[in-house]
Structures are given as C-alpha cells and as structure tokens.
C-alpha cells in the first residue's frame, strides 16, 4: 500500500519545508485516496468486465451512493462554502459503510482497500475541523448501515462484483467533485 500523506521520504528529507496548511493537507489527502481508488479499480476491471458493461447490465441501481447535486452548493454556479462543506462531510460519512463493504473484496489490493478506508476517516476529521456548522452534519444510523452491509454481503458473486465497481466509480466521482470545490474555499 502507498505511504499515507506526510510520511513519504521526501517529507523526512526536507525538514526546512513549510508545514502544510490545513487546505493543502486536505488536498493531499484526497489525492492520496484517489490514487488508492485507481489501484482498486484496476484490480476490479481486470478481474471482470463490469467496468465496460455495467450500464447495459443494470436496469436499476438502488445503492443510494452519495452524489453531488446543484443544491449542495459545491458547483461553480451557486457555490456556497458552508453548504458544500456540510455535503462533503455528510457524503463521506455515508460512504463509510460502502468502504467497509470493500474490505475483503480484493485479493492483491487488500492493504490498498484498508488504506482507502482509513485515509477517508482521517479526511473526515480534517474536514470536521474546518467546518463551522457541525450541527448540520447528519451521521448515518448504525443499525441501518449494519443491515445494508449484511444485504450487500449476501449478494451473489456477480452482484458483489457489480456493487464493488459502482462504489469505486461513485466514490471517485464524489472525491473529484469535492476536490474541485475545496480548492475554491
């Protein structure tokens, strides 16, 4: 698994470098997670043809994966820093159950899947420090998450491969949108 941000050899070898600002640290953390997702997607796409055929193989996707919408204030038109930050944090908290599902779904990238999960937890902490309105952030219900996890894990192999592909694709899109929005803050 890649080394988490702030622990690579370059950082150790350059003590004179200015410490990262909060925004830079968040930016770096997201890019680190995106690299991890790329590695996981590579394994998923090599293992099955889900990546090409997912559209025509599905009639409906009821996974309720977090997605950015106009009302969330994260797009250039109608940008709203506070609303957007709440959406990013809420979305990441909602993704956590899906990231838990991804554990044990990978053979050669098991550590990578764990790194993505742990780095996302760290990212949430960074963002929560940045947010002023923590009361507006709704935490997912643990009981609902537990039953969703059980349901996803009970699916057959084909559906589990499809679920894995959809989670990775959605999480990548969500993080890319978050990264663009956070760079405006």
């Amino acid at each position: 698994a890649p080394v988490p941000p702030g622990e690579d050899s370059k950082d150790v070898a350059a003590p004179h470098r200015q410490p990262l600002t909060s925004s830079e640290r968040i930016d770096k953390q997201i890019r680190y997670i995106l690299d991890g997702i790329s590695a996981l997607r590579k394994e998923t796409c090599n293992k099955s043809n889900m990546c090409e055929s997912s559209k025509e193989a599905l009639a409906e996707n009821n996974l309720n994966l977090p997605k950015m919408a106009e009302k969330d204030g994260c797009f250039q038109s109608g940008f709203n820093e506070e609303t957007c930050l709440v959406k990013i944090i809420t979305g990441l908290l909602e993704f956590e159950v899906y990231l838990e599902y991804l554990q044990n779904r990978f053979e050669s990238s098991e550590e990578q899947a764990r790194a993505v999960q742990m780095s996302t937890k760290v990212l949430i902490q960074f963002l929560q420090k940045k947010a002023k309105n923590l009361d507006a952030i709704t935490t997912p219900d643990p009981t609902t998450n537990a039953s969703l996890l059980t349901k996803l894990q009970a699916q057959n192999q084909w559906l589990q491969d499809m679920t894995t592909h959809l989670i990775l694709r959605s999480f990548k899109e969500f993080l890319q949108s978050s990264l663009r929005a956070l760079r405006q803050m």
């Epitope: 055929s53 025509e56 193989a57 599905l58 009639a59 409906e60 996707n61 009821n62 996974l63 309720n64 349901k151 996803l152 009970a154 699916q155 057959n156 084909w158 559906l159 499809m162 679920t163 959809l166």
Partner: nanobody
Framework: AVQLVDSGGGLVQAGDSLRLSCAAS????????MAWFRQAPGKEREFVAV????????YYADSVKGRFTISRDNAKNTVYLQMNSLKPEDTAVYYC?????????????????WGQGTQVTVSS
C-alpha cells in the same frame, strides 16, 4: 430461499396473446425484484422484462417493448408476463427469476432463484 414455478406457455399463432404466470413461495416476496428471461434453442438466455420490489417500476428489452407487460400481485406472490402481438421470433423457453438486492440486473447472473421454464411456441 424462494421457489418459483412458472406456467402458462403453449403453442399459439403469430399475432396471438399469452399470459405467463410465476408463483413464488416465501413470505418476503415483495422484497424481490422479479424478472422474465427467455432462451431459444442454441442461443443464450436473454432478458425480457423486470419489475422492481414493490412493483413501482418496470423495464423491458427493446425487442418486446410495447407488446409485453410485466406485473405482479404481492398478495398472491405471483408475477405475470402478458404477451401480445406474438411473433415467431418470440419462440423460446421463458424463465422467471428473482433477486433480493439493491441492484436490479438485466443480466441472468444477477439473479439467484429461477423457475423451471415454460415453453412458448409461436407459429407463423
């Protein structure tokens, strides 16, 4: 587990209608997305139609759109396929399938439970 028994097949003329039924055992029938697939001799099993859990949404293969209608009666644990304006190319063994998943597939591997199949033959 769910057991599916499909019925209603037969030999009909082109342009005729037929209604297939699929009876399911199991108390949680309404949790399952129900689909119909068909398989003609020497061909792969192909998607025909699917209806979502509560029956709110339906999806069809392009080849049957406007001619076939899928419906379900959760009180009777049964799903139906009304087939109108039948064509010789609709000749196949029709299978009913079920899955309890947030994903509703149009691929046979997305289904866990299958009926035994009912033969539909359309003569010209």
């Amino acid at each position: 587990a769910v057991q599916l028994v499909d019925s209603g097949g037969g030999l009909v003329q082109a342009g005729d209608s037929l209604r297939l039924s699929c009876a399911a055992s199991g108390r949680t029938f309404s949790n399952y997305a129900m689909a119909w697939f068909r398989q003609a001799p020497g061909k792969e099993r192909e998607f025909v139609a699917v209806i979502s859990y509560a029956g709110g949404r339906t999806y069809y293969a392009d080849s049957v759109k406007g001619r076939f209608t899928i419906s379900r009666d959760n009180a009777k644990n049964t799903v139906y396929l009304q087939m109108n304006s039948l064509k010789p190319e609709d000749t196949a063994v029709y299978y009913c399938a079920a899955v309890d998943s947030p994903l509703i597939a149009t691929h046979p591997r997305g289904y866990d439970y299958w009926g035994q199949g009912t033969q539909v033959t359309v003569s010209s």
